[in-house]
Structures are given as structure tokens and as C-alpha cells.
């Protein structure tokens, strides 16, 4: 039984330029139940905010609705994997909504 392996945010997609979804790949689970959370912050800010919607995009995803996509151009995201033995974090991903397709 080990802490979880490092997750990876591997893609973000915007089907309509009004919403976008990012997906991550879990690392190894360490043989224990693992919880995942995606947090984001604005460039130049340290205050972290949690994913508003883990449901819409399916498993291992975070969906940002119109009210989010319209408000900030850039998001810096990270996924945290946690089990009883510890935590691991993905690399930060810099997302500019302009370039999501």
C-alpha cells in the first residue's frame, strides 16, 4: 500500500468556445481508494479554487460552464490525488481559453 502515483492533465477541449472541459489520467492508485480534485487559480494569484463541476465531462474531468469561460482568459490548473497513505500532485497546466479547440 503506497501513496497514489502522479496524475496528469492531458487535454482540455472547448466544443463551442462557451464552455470547456479538462481531463486527467490517474497515476497508480497505490492499492487504495483514491480521491481526485482539480484546483485552479488565476495567473499572478495564489488563491486556489476547486473545480466547479466534476460530473458533466465524465470520469476524471472538470467542466467549466459559460459563467466561468466568459470570466477569465487564463487558468492554471493542477490535480491532487489522495489516499490514506498520502498525496501526489500533477504538474501545473497553464490554460489559455483562446487556444482551446
Amino acid at each position: 500500500q503506497l501513496p497514489p502515483g502522479k496524475p496528469e492533465i492531458f487535454k482540455c477541449r472547448s466544443p463551442n468556445k462557451e464552455t470547456f472541459t479538462c481531463w486527467w489520467r490517474p497515476g497508480t492508485d497505490g492499492g487504495l481508494p483514491t480521491n481526485y480534485s482539480l484546483t485552479y487559480h488565476r495567473e499572478g494569484e495564489t488563491l486556489m479554487h476547486e473545480c466547479p463541476d466534476y460530473i458533466t465531462g465524465g470520469p476524471n474531468s472538470c467542466h467549466f460552464g459559460k459563467q466561468y469561460t466568459s470570466m477569465w482568459r487564463t487558468y492554471i490548473m493542477m490535480v491532487n490525488a489522495t489516499n490514506q497513505m498520502g498525496s501526489s500532485f500533477s504538474d501545473e497546466l497553464y490554460v489559455d481559453v483562446t487556444y482551446i479547440v
Epitope: K17, L47, K66, Q67, T69, M71, R73
Partner: antibody, heavy 118, light 110 residues
Amino acid sequence: EVQLLESGGGLVQPGGSLRLSCAASGFTFGSYGMHWVRQAPGKGLEWVSLISWDGGSTYYADSVKGRFTISRDNSKNTLYLQMNSLRAEDTAVYYCASSISAAATGLDYWGQGTLVTV
Amino acid sequence: QSVLTQPPSASGTPGQRVTISCSGSTSNIGSNTVNWYQQLPGTVPKLLIYENKKRPSGVPDRFSGSKSGTSASLAISGLRSEDEADYYCAAWDDSLSGWVFGGGTKLTVL
């Protein structure tokens, strides 16, 4: 320091038009969506419209749809609200607001407002 | 008629705990986060709570927010005279593709 300064309010006849402006400073205006929110005298807050950071998406309250147009000029750091076919019920203080420091949806900066009287 | 329903008034004495409710539907509160605003007499609205329960810097921890299903509430503990204000809830509405505010609650400190 973040500042939002509305202008363009005044007295207008029913059916008339008015264009409000909101001059922004102290932040990277073109990276943030902007809202207009209004408040009739002695009444509550009413959301009016939202424009995305790039101007590509706009949203309106049903009460103003087809009459009001939100726009922005990122080169001038200015937000606009073109109000046509004005009605008595549009009389209100109009605020521009944005989400700058808090999470992307909480309006944490507001202008002082400009009064529109129809 | 506001899409989000709040009691028009609430009151309490100094030191008391007061709760203000905000009721909506599946298209707004049920599927999106809630923000709360405070408007002191004669002033501009101020963000008090965002994402259901988070406080912006500078907001005292006497203010707390919660959400359950299609309703949200704002609690103010250790009530002070300076808390006398109008309080508004707000949420994005997926059906309307826009923001909706509650009608506001006037809080009186007796």
C-alpha cells in the same frame, strides 16, 4: 488599484436611447469578463448582461434582451451598454462589475454606479 | 418576482446568530455555486461569500455560507450593529443562460 468608473447616465424619454460606459483601470481588462447589474430606486439587484473577456460571448437578462447591447473595447479598457427603446422600468442605478481576485464567478469589484432615469 | 427566493426581512439582537435562506431550482442553485452580497445603506454591493462557502479576504469569519440541493443559506454569528444591511444571493441559471439574484433580505439589528 482596481477602479471601475461608470458614466453616461441621465434623464431620457420613454422610447429613447442612452449609452453607458465603464472605464477600467488597475488590472488587465482584456483578460476578464464584465457584467452590468442594475438597481431600481429602493429595490433589489438585477443582473443585466455579461460579456466575455474577448467580447465573443454575450448574455442578457430576459427583461432587456433585444433592447440592450453590451460591448467592449479592450484597447480602450472600456465596457459599454447601449440601451434602446427605454422604458420607465429601466430606471435604475447601473453598475459595472467583475470577478478579479475571487473565484471566477464572484463579483468582487464594482463601480460606483450611474443613474438612468426614464 | 425574483428567480431566487429570499425572505424580505430578518432581525436579531447583538451577539445573536441569524440565518438568511435562498431558495432556487435545479437549473440555478441545484447545479451551480452560490454567491452572497452585502449592501450597506447607501453603498455599492460587496462580495461576501463565493462558491457557496468561501470568504474573500477581509470578510470576517462570522459570515458563513452553505448549500444543500436547491437551497442556500447565509449565517451571521455574533451579530453586530454594523451588519445591518441588505443581503442578496446570486447564482448562474443554466436554463436562462444568465445570472439571477434573490430579491434581497433586509437585516435589522435590534
